[in-house]
Interface confidence: low
Amino acid sequence: MGRARDAILDALENLTAEELKKFKLKLLSVPLREGYGRIPRGALLSMDALDLTDKLVSFYLETYGAELTANVLRDMGLQEMAGQLQAATHQGSGAAPAGIQAPPQSAAKPGLHFIDQHRAALIARVTNVEWLLDALYGKVLTDEQYQAVRAEPTNPSKMRKLFSFTPAWNWTCKDLLLQALRESQSYLVEDLERS
């Protein structure tokens, strides 16, 4: 296909340095369609237009990537650029409707991630949920998700809510949660690793 990718790249390359930075920051909090993960913040901030285009397409595929890019541009007040992007991607692309794309799959790694293997134990035994949320906020958790977890009354229900978002995460996102757990409750991780 490629048309949508070229249109995304064309739009991003036409942004000023300040606009590109603003685009990236908005991308961190823009609502995502269910089943899609968020590009990790650390990687995102250092990318130029070309890297960012590739990342958008690899995370969201071409059709949804273009739609998401247009949404962010529109949110920035760049309506004309958003319109041009959408027009370019709809010209005879022959793409399947955006709504039926599969979410990006986790990186191919053997077996279940530690986080998935020990889901029940983590729900029952993690006590420092606030720390985890602070660590994950803006990287893998959106504002809405962050608030939703915090709104839960108990630690287990907070963790259960947190796990409701993990099906959309890739391996890297789950690694971030594991790293946060190692830093906040290392004894728990060590205990589970031994089990």
């Epitope: 961190l28 913040r41 650390g42 660590a135 906020y137 803006g138 504002d143 608030q147 709104a151 830093e183």
Partner: antibody, heavy 117, light 111 residues
Framework: RVQLQQAGAELVKPGASVKVSCKAS????????IYWVKQRPGQGLEWIGR????????NYNQKFEGKATLTVDKSSGTAYMQLSSLTAEDSAVYYC??????????WGHGTSVTVSS | DIVLTQSPASLAVSLGQRATISCRAS??????????IHWYLQKPGQPPKLLIY???DLESGVPARFSGSGSGTGFTLNIHPVEEEDAATYYC?????????FGGGTKLEIK
């Protein structure tokens, strides 16, 4: 950006308490941590603690536990910090600040608290 | 608690020259590949104003003459070229763990 409004000054007697307010404009008050910072005259900044308006969850600097109590009134979009058993050491400017992602990027203008008999 | 030591305590820089302020942490403030250090400026009678977050990210609306660098325990704020309006006290602050702490401040004077 959310604006934070604070009263200008409070004069209180030693041993008394004072309640400092911080009113947020805009309807995003419930989404962000509100932080409190102390600055004594001609001195640096000290982090007191934070409160999340959605559920009144708090984290305190141990140094200020028992001295500062953080509360919120969601209906009015106002955060409060009560300082108790005041001494001359508590004379300072107290700032509220809002953290949107990683750092405190919106600040009130500060409330000057003077403890004097 | 993590102690942040700023140096120098004060400095005077000629208009158009470079100002460099250092902030050293008593232990690493890096985690998850992020450097949890932020820089603020404060003018007399005003609240602090965020300049740089996560060691090197420029806050929206802050002039590009401000830049931050560093990782682990050592961080630097650079201002180049220095302008008249940059006369202020500069603070570093970490958010790596509770309690968050600030450096002692560096007072910048423009010659």
């Amino acid at each position: 950006r959310v604006q934070l409004q604070q009263a200008g000054a409070e004069l209180v007697k030693p041993g008394a308490s004072v309640k400092v307010s911080c009113k947020a404009s805009g309807n995003t008050f419930n989404n962000y941590w509100i932080y409190w910072v102390k600055q004594r005259p001609g001195q640096g900044l000290e982090w007191i603690g934070r409160i999340h308006p959605s559920d009144s969850g708090t984290n305190y600097n141990q140094k200020f536990e028992g001295k500062a109590t953080l509360t919120v009134d969601k209906s009015s979009g106002t955060a409060y910090m009560q300082l108790s058993s005041l001494t001359a050491e508590d004379s300072a400017v107290y700032y509220c600040a809002l953290l949107s992602l990683y750092a405190m990027d919106s600040w009130g203008h500060g409330t000057s608290v003077t403890v004097s008999s | 608690d993590i102690v942040l030591t700023q140096s120098p305590a004060s400095l005077a820089v000629s208009l158009g020259q470079r100002a460099t302020i250092s902030c050293r942490a008593s232990k690493s403030v890096s985690s998850f590949g992020y450097n949890y250090i932020h820089w603020y400026l404060q003018k007399p009678g005003q609240p602090p104003k965020l300049l740089i977050y996560l060691a090197s990210d420029l806050e929206s609306g802050v002039p590009a003459r401000f830049s931050g660098s560093g990782s682990g325990t050592g961080f630097t704020l650079n201002i180049h070229p220095v302008e008249e309006e940059d006369a202020a006290t500069y603070y570093c602050q970490h958010s790596r763990e509770f309690p968050w702490t600030f450096g002692g401040g560096t007072k910048l004077e423009i010659k």
